[in-house]
Interface confidence: low
């Protein structure tokens, strides 16, 4: 069937439209286009004869139409009047006619809209504002946007006048936003520039900051006032009802008790004509004296002396507080406070009691701290430590030993070699040592205040060869699945590589094996009975190498669940019952038997001659390992049948 399609159907003024013909019959003589829904000679636009390819304009031809051989009609520079129906009249070669009608609509291109307002400065909670989208345009749809979002649902928002007018009732400060309107028709959409609604509000009740209302004499008072307001508020300060100044901040330096009182901030909005006030009460306290600490013993001796610390000055009806190391006082039988907390006594001071100590006096406003006091506790010397810890050196190197002993005042040091005094220094240095420098090296530390002395002796061996190492262990009898064992390869030597073997093999990779201390220490975590092996350590430097004798680890384990043999549970009357119990255990466990819960004998083997059915019952073997402290047991049921009725036997 012959049809007309308009492309596009909605056409913008000034654009073009194509009336496209579908299903055009064969064997045509020609065709004509008409304006309207019927064939009317007065409204013919154009005719076309196929044979001559001649187009003839009609009365309704405007000069903007072009006809195509396929009968389609293009209309250019569309005007509003072009809206409507168009009819195609087709004349076939057999002079039979066919008609089809199509249509399109013409719309104007919309101009950019703008917003007009009936109130440029509405007052919060009082005024309404009506926005109108200009210009008024026929066949246009109006839309509104707030902060680029579609209109929220609100009883205070109302659309009218075909959505052209947006009214905000009872405006609030939250209505301060960007408003845009949009006009739409089938061929265009345009959005206005934004209009910012300027809502006048406030002032709200002012806020005075800081919130602090208590001050010390001599401080500066600096109060700031703020109230939400549009336009910004104008501020005034009143002290005890008397006007002070018209500023947002009030500053009074070096205040005294006389500055105590009520401080009022007034906020005024000149546009809304509203005033709001807030009052705060300021209290100024007199400054108490700064406390200080006195001590009855400035150089106490560790483990001998007591020290009494007193917080000065003495003030009636005052709370005294104490701190040690910036913490409140720990609970300790060596710390005692007097009834008024003013005196803190340290009984039998230690080096850890040096402090610092602070005391404080509490007043209505705050706590005043004293300067910290540090105790000079005399102690030591402790046993000196000689470093480095090496005991083995190669000839030709320099020997540099350092001695240190904890002591106050610091210790004075002396060095002796094989009992002969060498020098009074903390460090001993001997260059280019030989085997002759082997011997006993003694460091003596002396505390001049206490007169105490302590010594440490170290054996130094100077040899070109590494000695045969040995293995020391921190646990000679570890318990399985419980203990760890640390093997250390001795001695510690400079520039030496330490190595380990287990049963003649290099160390297996295992999360339970850990090397530390420069590979000198091998730790076995959570030992198992499989760790009972031969361990060897080796030492190597660029001159020589050596291996230790093996050390076999004796792992205590068990007892495991025992096994009773033979496995038989059925016996004939008159037979001998000979049960043997075995449990894997190190050391070997102690065995005991119970028959039907009754203790029997403490042996590994239970023997009963010529059993009878009376010997039926439960036979329990108990094992205990005194070294591991662990126990285990197993129960076996024994059935004794009268002769000739043994289960499983038949005539």
């Amino acid at each position: 069937k012959l049809t007309i399609e308009s492309t596009p159907f909605n056409v913008a003024e000034g654009k073009e439209v194509l009336l496209l013909v579908h299903n055009l019959p064969q064997h045509l003589f020609g065709y004509s286009w008409y304006k309207g829904e019927r064939v009317d000679g007065n409204r013919q636009i154009i005719g076309y004869v196929i044979g001559t390819q001649q187009a003839t304009p009609g009365p309704a031809y405007s000069g903007r139409e072009i006809i195509y051989p396929n009968a389609s009609l293009l209309i250019q520079n569309i005007i509003q009047n072009d809206t409507g129906f168009y009819t195609l009249h087709v004349i076939k070669s057999d002079l039979v006619n066919e008609e089809a009608t199509g249509q399109f609509r013409v719309y104007p291109e919309l101009p950019k809209p703008s917003i007009s307002s009936n109130n440029s400065k509405p007052v919060e909670d009082k005024d309404a504002v009506a926005f109108t989208c200009e210009p008024e345009t026929q066949d246009a749809t109006y839309l509104w946007w707030v902060n680029n979002q579609s209109l929220p649902v609100s009883p205070r928002l109302q659309l009218s006048n075909g959505n052209r007018t947006l009214t905000l009732f009872n405006v609030t400060r939250n209505d301060t936003a960007s408003y845009k309107c949009e006009t739409q028709n089938p061929v265009s959409a345009r959005r206005s520039d934004s209009v910012i609604l300027n809502v006048l509000y406030g002032p709200d009740a002012p806020t005075i900051s800081p919130l602090n209302t208590s001050y010390r004499s001599g401080e500066n008072l600096n109060l700031s006032c703020h109230a939400a307001s549009n336009p910004p508020a104008q501020y005034s300060w009143f002290v005890n009802g008397t006007f002070q100044q018209s500023t947002q901040e009030l500053f009074i330096p070096n205040i005294t008790v006389n500055n105590s009182g009520s401080y009022t901030c007034q906020a005024h909005n000149s546009d809304t004509g509203l005033n709001r006030t807030t009052v705060t009460t300021i209290t100024v306290y007199a400054e108490p004296p700064k406390p200080f600490i006195t001590s009855n013993n400035s150089n106490p001796v560790e483990d001998e002396d007591a020290v009494a610390l007193t917080c000065e000055p003495e003030i009636q009806n005052t709370t005294y507080l104490w701190w040690v190391n910036n913490q409140s006082l720990p609970v300790s039988p060596r710390l005692q406070l007097s009834n008024d907390n003013r005196t803190l006594t340290l009984l039998s001071v230690t080096r850890n009691d040096v402090g610092p100590y602070e005391c404080g006096i509490q007043n209505e406003l705050s706590v005043d701290h004293s300067d910290p006091v540090i105790l000079n506790v005399l102690y030591g010397p402790d046993d000196p430590t000689i470093s480095p810890s090496y005991t083995y050196y190669r000839p030709g190197v320099n020997l540099s030993l350092s001695c240190h002993a904890a002591s106050n005042p610091p210790a004075q040091y002396s060095w002796l070699i094989d009992g002969n005094i060498q020098q009074h220094t903390q460090e001993l240095f001997i260059s280019n040592i030989t085997e002759k420098n082997s011997g006993l090296y003694t460091c003596q530390a002396n505390n001049s205040a206490s007169g105490h002395s302590r010594t440490t002796v170290k054996t130094i061996t100077v040899s070109a060869e590494l000695p045969k190492p040995s293995i020391s262990s921190n646990n000679s009898k570890p318990v399985e699945d419980k203990d760890a064992v640390a093997f250390t390869c001795e001695p510690e030597a400079q520039n030496t590589t330490y190595l380990w073997w287990v049963n003649g093999q290099s160390l297996p990779v295992s999360p339970r094996l850990q090397l530390s201390n420069g590979n000198r220490t091998l730790t076995l975590f959570n030992v198992t009975r499989n760790d009972a092996r031969a361990y060897v350590c080796g030492i190597q430097n660029s001159v020589s190498a050596n291996r230790s004798d093996p050390v076999t680890l004796d792992v205590l384990y068990g007892p495991d669940t025992p096994i009773i043999s033979p496995p038989d549970s059925s016996y004939l009357s008159g037979a001998n019952l000979n049960l043997s119990c075995h449990s894997a255990s190190n050391p070997s466990p102690q065995y005991s038997w119970r028959i039907n819960g009754i203790p029997q004998q403490h042996t590994q083997v239970l023997f009963i001659a010529k059993i009878t059915p009376n010997n039926n019952g439960t036979y329990a073997c108990f094992v205990s390992n005194l070294a591991t402290g662990r126990n285990n047991s197993i129960v076996k049921s024994i059935t004794v049948s009268a002769s000739g009725t043994s289960p499983g036997l038949s005539a």
């Epitope: 070109a464 060869e465 000695p467 590589t497 290099s506 080796g538 190597q540 020589s544 190498a545 050596n546």
Partner: antibody, heavy 116, light 108 residues
Framework: DVQLVQSGGGLVQPGGSLRLSCAGS????????MSWLRQAPGKGLEWVAN????????NYVDSVKGRFTISRDNAQNSLYLQMSSLRAEDTAVYYC?????????WGQGTLLTVSP | EIVLTQSPGTLSLSPGERATLSCRAS???????LAWYQQRPGQAPRLLIY???SRATGVPDRFSGSGSGTDFTLTISRLEAEDFAMYHC?????????FGQGTMVDIK
């Protein structure tokens, strides 16, 4: 100074025997593992055998096991390698050296030639 | 046994240049137990490096060793006349002790 002086090389027929010696000075040999190594003409080094301080532990490369014996005399500060059932492939410069893992002092080397 | 492969077989350089010698093991070497030796013509080998990176007594600091696992390197930062020689690597992580076939550093 550590010194290792070797002796005993020479020409031997296949199947023959020979003993190499190595005399140490400047160190206490009873504190050191000792080793024998060899280097065939134009080839790389090959470890042959070693012995611990008191002679109770000995190790050999597979190719000489059962044919070579390493020994020591700590009183003489001496190391020995007794070689028997010699083969043409044993032809090499033989070195004695001090050490269990690495070899920090070496003898001057002695040439063993096994040839008919 | 662990097989050591040294590369290159020969390294031709001039005095003052940097030499980088490689030693690759057929399997992981325990505890970085690898040593390097220098052997001049007609002389016994001399220990340079042990434990992969520790210099032996009296070895100049222009010799340095690095590496772990299966890949090891000997570096001579600035070659001097006496450094032109054969260099051997040796593993001592397992028996038998084995050596590489050697790298010859000669004058270009």
């Amino acid at each position: 100074d550590v010194q290792l002086v070797q002796s005993g090389g020479g020409l031997v027929q296949p199947g023959g025997s020979l003993r190499l010696s190595c005399a140490g000075s400047g160190f206490t040999s009873s504190l050191s593992w000792m080793s024998w190594l060899r280097q065939a003409p134009g080839k790389g080094l090959e470890w042959v055998a070693n012995i611990n301080q008191d002679g109770s532990e000995k190790n050999y490369v597979d190719s000489v096991k059962g044919r070579f014996t390493i020994s020591r005399d700590n009183a003489q500060n001496s190391l020995y390698l007794q070689m028997s059932s010699l083969r043409a492939e044993d032809t090499a410069v033989y070195y004695c050296a001090r050490g269990l893992w690495t070899f920090d002092s070496w003898g001057q080397g002695t040439l063993l030639t096994v040839s008919p | 046994e662990i097989v050591l492969t040294q590369s290159p077989g020969t390294l031709s350089l001039s005095p003052g240049e940097r030499a980088t010698l490689s030693c690759r093991a057929s399997q992981n070497i325990n505890n970085r137990f690898l040593a390097w030796y220098q052997q001049r013509p007609g002389q016994a080998p001399r220990l340079l490096i042990y434990a992969a990176s520790s210099r032996a007594t009296g070895v100049p600091d222009r010799f340095s060793g690095s590496g772990s696992g299966t890949d090891f390197t000997l570096t001579i930062s600035r070659l001097e006349a006496e450094d032109f020689a054969m260099y051997h690597c040796q593993q001592y992580g397992s028996f038998p002790r084995t050596f590489g076939q050697g790298t010859m550093v000669d004058i270009k």
